[in-house]
């Protein structure tokens, strides 16, 4: 007896983090025997969408012409062949930015920091939020979460880095979010350039890979040291 049908592959173009109003295409790739593709969104009535396969029948396209809150969430896809439905794909998390006003990102004491010293990146929102995310451009694992322990909302989150090395240098942005949907993020903050001076080691060029790419051993996220700031926020690496 044949085993279960292989699970399809699910991905989004141009990526899985999309600004409000922009278009995104979700692709589901199965096998040449596929007769129909189905996309399901977590916590929504199923099927979310159904599409006939594109020639040569091994994939289907699900188009979102204009990103809104309704489309943000966690997706899986399936395909139907003559012998039945496939296993579900691995999940795709589609995140929308632009749901809230942009926070402000600053560096304390300064964005110009000497290697070996400490710096704290401060993300501040005008309205209270319970999740803050720090993103470093071109990092393979760009997300660092600070999330409220008990739903207590905060106007800011601190991301301490100590001791600073040349690897910490680069361009950062932060986002804020409400816990009721971590698929909805604020507009990004204006970029903050962190410049590390006085280092004897050569700065490594940051790999130009997409957010969704798996990290290699040299691209692991930098864990800030020190205790969690006294803000009721808990640190999560994603």
């Amino acid at each position: 007896q044949a085993g279960p049908l292989p699970k399809p592959t699910l991905w989004a173009e141009p990526g899985s983090v999309i600004s409000w109003g922009n278009s995104v295409t979700i692709w589901c790739q199965g096998t040449l025997e596929a007769r129909e593709y189905r996309l399901d969104k977590e916590e929504s009535p199923a099927p979310w969408d159904r599409q006939n396969p594109l020639e040569p029948k091994n994939k289907a396209r699900f188009s979102i012409p204009s990103m809104t809150e309704d489309y943000a969430g966690r997706y899986r896809c399936y395909y139907r062949s003559p012998v039945g439905w496939s296993q579900p794909s691995d999940p795709l998390e589609l995140v929308m930015t632009g749901a809230y006003s942009k926070p402000t990102l600053s560096a304390l004491p300064s964005p110009l920091v000497t290697s070996g010293k400490s710096v704290t990146l401060l993300c501040q929102s005008r309205s209270p939020m319970d999740t803050f995310l720090l993103i470093k451009e071109r990092a393979a694992h760009p997300l660092l979460h600070l999330r409220s322990e008990h739903g207590a909302q905060q106007h800011q989150a601190e991301f301490p880095m100590s001791p600073v090395t040349s690897v910490h240098g680069g361009t950062y942005r932060c986002f804020s979010s409400h816990g009721f949907s971590h698929y909805l993020l604020s507009h990004p903050s204006d970029p903050l350039e962190l410049i590390v001076s006085g280092s004897l080691e050569d700065p490594r060029p940051s790999p130009t890979r997409s957010v969704s790419t798996a990290a290699g051993p040299e691209d692991q996220p930098l864990m800030p040291t020190g205790s969690v700031p006294h803000s009721g926020l808990r640190r999560h690496w994603e």
């Epitope: 399901d40 969104k41 916590e43 929504s44 009535p45 199923a46 099927p47 979310w48 969408d49 159904r50 309704d70």
Partner: nanobody, 121 residues
Framework: EVQLVESGGGLVQPGGSLRLSCAAS????????MGWYRQAPGKQRELVAA???????KIGDSVKGRFTISRDNAKNSVYLQMNSLRAEDTAVYYC???????????????WGQGTQVTVSS
């Protein structure tokens, strides 16, 4: 061939209840989200409720806490239970079927003919 057939509409007093039914062909029912829209005179069509093959539901904000939707797989039918009815619930109620994303876009694949609900004393 009519593929979605509604029933259960009528005249009811404010505060009363009605249960709408929609029978579908098996091929439509088994693979689609089923739901209800309504359209009052001079107003835009509004999504009232929807239920998926996974039994997860979406209830419109204006009827939350008063209306519930359910589906009976054995009978290929979907039901809209309407409680605490108000005058503003007066409308033609349409059964619909399709993928859920098309419910959000107000363009399901299949529509019923509609059944009139009038809430008046």
């Amino acid at each position: 061939e009519v593929q979605l057939v509604e029933s259960g509409g009528g005249l009811v007093q404010p505060g009363g209840s009605l249960r709408l039914s929609c029978a579908a062909s098996e091929s439509i029912f088994s693979s689609n989200v089923m739901g209800w829209y309504r359209q009052a005179p001079g107003k835009q069509r509004e999504l009232v409720a929807a239920v998926g093959i996974n039994r997860l539901t979406k209830i419109g904000d204006s009827v939350k806490g008063r209306f519930t939707i359910s589906r009976d797989n054995a009978k290929n039918s979907v039901y809209l239970q309407m409680n605490s009815l108000r005058a503003e619930d007066t409308a033609v109620y349409y059964c619909a079927a399709g993928a859920y994303v098309r419910f959000l876009q107000y363009s399901p694949d299949y529509w019923g003919q509609g059944t009139q609900v009038t809430v008046s004393s």
